[in-house]
């Protein structure tokens, strides 16, 4: 009934932008976006005791305030400051798993290894995962038709700025040994233009972070190459070393077995290299 009250009070804001309005190149706001954000917030705060006191109505107000009535190509990190603040969350700073171009495996891993956290295991990451949203300048409406594409339209769009902002804060909070899962099947295993490469790497705090450990995930069963020697991994090592953070790298040759061994570490086959 709490959710229903919230929806009733705010119905006016959720009309679609008329079809004749500006068309962007990207997909429009995810259907039932406000309801989805609120429902996810309620679910998350019920499950995570340290966030139980968070007021999901205030969280939605802050989320909405970041992009409603604003030009969707002119969003700033400052617009998201209230949401970032309300979503402040203390995760064990030595249990952070970053990822690049391999989200599903990273999430499967933290679902098993419950003491480790990806960004999407935090409240803010969970709220926005796989969602799209944007508004329109000077109207209080959400645009369900189209939203700016990062490449074709503009980079300072609501979704991109959100992920940049929340990723920066997540990286800033990390300490000790930070892990990153990288996709060994891609031509650029480490991509300087990814969120990891452009935001998170540069916001790890050298005074708190001792080591960045990369896990390079192999795609083919017969792939026995040492992908830690890949030129892009060497580039990552160079960037990290210049920031006075140590770097290490491990090949995960068989991700299926890797997950199995995380689930059952006492299995005799888990002593060999995976």
């Amino acid at each position: 009934s709490g959710l229903n009250d919230i929806f009733e009070a705010q119905k006016i804001e959720w009309h679609e932008v008329p079809r004749w309005r500006q068309q962007w190149s990207g997909p429009g706001t995810t259907k039932r976006f406000p309801e989805t954000v609120l429902a996810r917030c309620v679910k998350y705060t019920e499950i995570h005791p340290e966030m139980r006191h968070v007021d999901c109505q205030s969280v939605w107000d802050a989320f909405k305030g970041a992009f409603i009535s604003k030009h969707p190509c002119n969003i700033t990190e400052e617009d998201y400051q209230p949401l970032m603040k309300l979503g402040t969350q203390t995760v064990p700073c030595n249990k952070i798993l970053l990822w690049s171009r391999i989200k599903d495996l990273a999430h499967q891993f933290t679902q098993v290894q419950r003491d480790m956290f990806t960004l999407e295991d935090t409240l803010l990451g969970y709220l926005a995962d796989d969602l799209t949203w944007c508004g329109e300048f000077n109207t209080s409406k959400i645009n369900y038709q189209s939203c700016p594409d990062w490449r074709k339209d503009c980079s300072n769009n609501p979704v991109s700025v959100f992920w940049k902002t929340v990723s920066r804060r997540f990286a800033e909070a990390a300490c000790d040994v930070v892990h990153v899962m990288l996709n060994g099947s891609r031509s650029k295993i480490f991509d300087k233009n990814s969120t990891f490469g452009s935001v998170e790497v540069h916001n790890l705090q050298p005074e708190k972070v001792q080591t960045l450990e990369a896990w390079v995930i192999h795609g083919g069963r017969e792939d026995s190459r040492d992908l830690c020697q890949d030129p892009t991994i060497k580039e990552l090592e160079s960037i990290i070393s210049k920031r006075n953070i140590q770097f290490s790298c491990k090949n995960i040759y068989r991700p299926d077995k890797f997950l199995q061994c995380v689930k059952n570490p006492e299995d005799s086959s888990c002593t060999s290299e995976i």
Epitope: E50, H53, G65, Q81, K85, G87, T90, E172, A173, K208
Partner: antibody, heavy 121, light 110 residues
């Protein structure tokens, strides 16, 4: 110069209500979180509520304050209010408003404080 | 509820002494270092001394320093001056943007 000035304190009967004001000057009011913090006589500090209103009001409360206390803001008057209902003897305290440091690296700290206003229940 | 425990509650010192105040949090603060220290004199509002555990606030003398991370923090005054006799509070920042203050440490003249 940044200034915060509280008013509205006084003597009130248990069960009564009071509205405190915090008038701000010397800074761009909309760009900062304003926090109410209280201090019982001879005791430590305790946060009450927070508000920020770049466009609409965003506010939240300490668990114990939810339901009885309401924070609001009048941007035209550069003033933040704390409406306190169903007051109890244990609400007796000096009530301060404070401005949080600006910027994500600095949030969570209070750089500017008012002089406080005493509420006696 | 989050508890911030300061020790000692009272501390007697002479001018020139080195003074250390400890603050322990029942939960880790945000970002492992999101803790502040304030100084308060009788009848006055608190004044920010340190933020993010070890960063000196604007205008604060360098004899003040802070350290610690996670749940244990210290404030040190390397050489106490007459102006430093006051009560000191630690303040943590936590999940959901909640705040908690320590019970205070009164530094008095020996």
């Amino acid at each position: 110069e940044v200034q915060l000035l509280e008013s509205g304190g006084g003597l009130v009967q248990p069960g009564g209500s009071l509205r405190l004001s915090c008038a701000a000057s010397g800074f761009s009011f909309n760009n900062y979180w304003i926090i109410w913090i209280r201090q019982a006589p001879g005791k430590g500090l305790e946060w009450v509520a927070a508000i920020y209103s770049p466009s609409g009001d965003i506010k939240y409360y300490a668990d114990w304050a939810k339901g009885r206390f309401t924070v609001s803001k009048d941007n035209s008057k550069n003033t933040v209010y704390l409406q306190m209902n169903s007051l109890r003897a244990e609400d007796t305290a000096v009530y301060y408003c404070a401005r949080e440091l600006s910027g994500s690296s600095y949030e969570g700290y209070f750089e500017s404080w008012g002089q406080g206003t005493l509420v006696t229940v | 509820d989050i508890q911030l425990t300061q020790s000692p509650s009272t501390l007697s010192a002479s001018v020139g002494d080195r003074v250390t105040i400890t603050c322990r949090s029942s939960q880790s603060v945000y970002g492992h270092n999101w803790l502040a220290w304030y100084q308060q004199k009788p009848g006055k509002a608190p004044k920010l001394l340190m933020y993010r555990a070890s960063n000196l606030a604007s205008g604060v003398p360098s004899r003040f320093s802070g350290s610690g991370s996670g749940t244990e923090f210290t404030l040190t005054i390397s050489s106490v001056q007459p102006d430093d006799f006051a009560t000191y509070y630690c303040q943590g920042y936590y999940s959901g943007a909640s705040y908690a203050f320590g019970g205070g440490t009164k530094v008095e003249i020996k």
